[in-house]
C-alpha cells in the first residue's frame, strides 16, 4: 500500500476588529473564513502542479478579535491607522511555527488599491512562504515568513467575494512560490488578440481582477512551474496527510457535529468542546437539535428557529434567507429575476449573483474605455459598452452612441471596480489608480533584510 | 458519493403502523444529520423527522410529534422511522435525505409510497 501523502496546508487565521464590525458576529465571520478556505481550496485541488495533486488547505486554528479587543494591549492589529507593510509585519512579528501558514483578514482600505500581501515562497535559501521557521532576522527582530494578509475594502467599497477568494488564492500562490505572472504566455487579458483577451488574467495577474473571466481562478503556466518546485522540496516540512477533521477550530467540518472551540472559547451551551473526551467532543449534547456552531438558524437555546425568521439580508439579487424550522443551515435565497439592476446600476444579476455588466441588459458587451484606445482618460472609470465582438464599437454609457439605451446617463463605475484593462481601480473621485504591483513588498523587504534577500515578497 | 434508498412502504389501514428503512451506500456516514421528508400529492415536500448520526439527538414536526420514532443503527449505515396511530393525512410518498456540512439535505433517495386507508 502507498503511505497518504503529506497535501495538506494547515492554516491559522485572525481577523482584526474591523473585520469584526464589518460582518458583525463571531458565526458570520467563520462564515467568511470558511468561505474564503473553501474556495482556496477548490482551486488548489483541481490544479495540477506538475504531478503534484490534491493540494487542500485545513484551518487548524482561528482567533477573532471583535470590537472588544480595539484597546486590549496583548492584540496587536488593534491600531487604526496602519499601512499594509506594517500590518503583515505584525502579523509576522508573531510565532507562527505550527502552521504550514498564518493570515490575517480585515476591512482597510489600503493606499494604491492593495488587497493584499505575502511573503513569497522559493525552493531553495527562501526566507519567506510556506512552512518557514520563526528567526531572527537582520533588523533584530524574530519573525515568522509564512504570513500573508488580504482586505475586503478597497477604495471605500466591499469588494465582491469571488474577488476577495482570487486575492486570497493569489497572496496564497505567493507563499507557495509563484511570483506575479508576465510575458504574453502568462498575461493573456493584455493580448490584443480579441479571443485571447477575453478569458482574462490568471491569479497571479500583478494588478486588478473583476474574478468573472474564465482565467481568473487559474493558475497559469508560469504559476504551476515556479510553485511545483516550491511545492517538491517545501511539502514534506509542514503539510499534513488530509483525513480528521480539527474539533476546536471553530468550524463544522465533516465528521463533526459542531464546533464552538475549546473550553476557553466555547459560549455554547449545544455543542460539547474541543476539550472533551474523544467520543464527545464537536459532539450535540444530549437532547439538544443544533448548535450556533451550524448555522444562524439555531438559537442560543440550541433550537432550531422558527419558519420565517430572517437568516440572510436580502441582496441585490437574491431575496432575503428564510430559516425552514428544521435545519440550523440558511437554506438557499431565491434569485431575483435575471437582468435585475445590481451594484448601482453598474451590473445585472444573472443566477441569483451579480455578475454581468449592465450592458448585457441591452445585448452589448462590456468593454474598457482605455486610454491606449486614444480615449479620455476621464472616461476610463465609465460603464463603456460596445457591440458584442466589435472594439471599434465600445463607448461610454453616457456617449451618443448610446443614448436609446442610457438616455445620455453617465452610468460610472463603483469606487474600487477594475479600471483601464485592469491596470487599476477607481478610486472615490472616478479616477483610475494604477496599481504599484510591488512597492509595499519592497518597502518592507529594505525595512527588515539584509540587501541579498530582497527577493522574497509580494502582493 | 452517498445513495440512499427507501423501503419498507405499503398500504395500511388507519391506526396501523409501518416502519420505513433508509440504507445508505458509498462513502460512509460522517453527515450530520439524516431526515425523513414527506410529499403528498398536490402538496409540497414536508419535513418529518431528523436525526444526528453521531449522537442520535432526534428533531420531529409537529404533525407527527410522539406517533413517529426516528432511529438508526451505525453498523448497518442504516436509518429507520417506526410510525404508528397512522392516519390517512399522513399518505404520502416518504423520502429520506441527508445533510452535510454547509448543505442542507442535498442528497435524496428515490422514495417509498405509503398510503393510509379509512
Known amino acids: 500500500t502507498t503511505s497518504a501523502e503529506k497535501n495538506t496546508c494547515q492554516l491559522y487565521i485572525q481577523t482584526d476588529h474591523l473585520f469584526f464590525k464589518y460582518y458583525g458576529t463571531r458565526e458570520a465571520v467563520i462564515a467568511q473564513i470558511s468561505s474564503h478556505v473553501k474556495a482556496i481550496d477548490t482551486i488548489y485541488q483541481t490544479t495540477d502542479f506538475s504531478g503534484i495533486r490534491n493540494i487542500s488547505f485545513m484551518v487548524k486554528r482561528i482567533r477573532i478579535n471583535t470590537t472588544a479587543d480595539e484597546k486590549d494591549p496583548t492584540n496587536p492589529f488593534r491600531f487604526p491607522n496602519i499601512g499594509v507593510e506594517k500590518f503583515l509585519e505584525l502579523n509576522s512579528e508573531q510565532n507562527h511555527d505550527d502552521y504550514c501558514l498564518a493570515y490575517v483578514f480585515t476591512d482597510r482600505d489600503f493606499d494604491d488599491g492593495v488587497l493584499g500581501l505575502a511573503w513569497v515562497g522559493a525552493p531553495s535559501g527562501s526566507s519567506g512562504g510556506i512552512c518557514e521557521k520563526s528567526k531572527l532576522y537582520s533588523d533584530g527582530k524574530k519573525k515568522s515568513l509564512n504570513t500573508g494578509i488580504i482586505t475586503v475594502q478597497n477604495y471605500g467599497s466591499h469588494v465582491p467575494p469571488k474577488v476577495s477568494h482570487i486575492t486570497f488564492a493569489h497572496e496564497v500562490g505567493h507563499n507557495f512560490g509563484s511570483p506575479h505572472d508576465s510575458g504574453t504566455e502568462c498575461t493573456p487579458g493584455e493580448s490584443k488578440n480579441l479571443g485571447q483577451k477575453e478569458n482574462g488574467n490568471y491569479i497571479m495577474y500583478a494588478r486588478a481582477t473583476s474574478g468573472d473571466k474564465l482565467n481568473n481562478n487559474k493558475f497559469s503556466l508560469c504559476s504551476i512551474r515556479n510553485i511545483s518546485q516550491v511545492l517538491e522540496k517545501k511539502r514534506n516540512n509542514c503539510f499534513v496527510e488530509s483525513g480528521q477533521p480539527i474539533c476546536g477550530n471553530g468550524m463544522v467540518e465533516q465528521g463533526e457535529e459542531c464546533d464552538c472551540g475549546y473550553s476557553d472559547q466555547c459560549k455554547d451551551e449545544c455543542c460539547f468542546d474541543a476539550n472533551q473526551p474523544e467520543g464527545r467532543k464537536c459532539k450535540l449534547k444530549p437532547g439538544k437539535q443544533c448548535s450556533p456552531s451550524q448555522g444562524p438558524c439555531c438559537t442560543a437555546q440550541c433550537a432550531f428557529k422558527s419558519k420565517s425568521e430572517k437568516c440572510r439580508d436580502d441582496s441585490d439579487c437574491a431575496r432575503e434567507g428564510i430559516c425552514n424550522g428544521f435545519t440550523a443551515l440558511c437554506p438557499a435565497s431565491d434569485p431575483k429575476p435575471n437582468f435585475t439592476d445590481c451594484n448601482r446600476h453598474t451590473q445585472v444579476c444573472i443566477n441569483g449573483q451579480c455578475a454581468g455588466s449592465i450592458c448585457e441588459k441591452y445585448g452589448l458587451e462590456e468593454c474598457t474605455c482605455a486610454s491606449s484606445d486614444g480615449k479620455d482618460d476621464k472616461e476610463l472609470c465609465h460603464v463603456c459598452c460596445m457591440k458584442k465582438m466589435d472594439p471599434s464599437t465600445c463607448a461610454s454609457t453616457g456617449s451618443v452612441q448610446w443614448s436609446r439605451h442610457f438616455s445620455g446617463r453617465t452610468i460610472t463605475l463603483q469606487p474600487g471596480s477594475p479600471c483601464n484593462d485592469f491596470r487599476g481601480y477607481c478610486d472615490v473621485f472616478m479616477r483610475c489608480r494604477l496599481v504599484d504591483a510591488d512597492g509595499p513588498l519592497a518597502r518592507l523587504k529594505k525595512a527588515i533584510f539584509s540587501p541579498e534577500l530582497y527577493e522574497n515578497i509580494a502582493e | 458519493e452517498v445513495q440512499l434508498v427507501e423501503s419498507g412502504g405499503g398500504l395500511v389501514q388507519a391506526g396501523g403502523s409501518l416502519t420505513l428503512s433508509c440504507a445508505a451506500s458509498?462513502?460512509?456516514?460522517?453527515?450530520?444529520?439524516l431526515g425523513w421528508f414527506r410529499q403528498a400529492p398536490g402538496n409540497e415536500r414536508e419535513f418529518v423527522a431528523s436525526?444526528?448520526?453521531?449522537?442520535?439527538?432526534?428533531y420531529y414536526a409537529d404533525s407527527v410529534k410522539g406517533r413517529f420514532t426516528i432511529s438508526r443503527e451505525r453498523a448497518k449505515n442504516t436509518m429507520y422511522l417506526q410510525m404508528d396511530s397512522l392516519r390517512p393525512e399522513d399518505t404520502a410518498v416518504y423520502y429520506c435525505?441527508?445533510?452535510?456540512?454547509?448543505?442542507?439535505?442535498?442528497?435524496w433517495g428515490q422514495g417509498t409510497q405509503v398510503t393510509v386507508s379509512s
Open positions: 436525526i444526528t448520526w453521531s449522537s442520535a439527538n432526534t
Open positions: 435525505a441527508k445533510e452535510d456540512v454547509g448543505k442542507p439535505f442535498d442528497s
Open positions: 458509498g462513502r460512509t456516514f460522517s453527515s450530520y444529520r
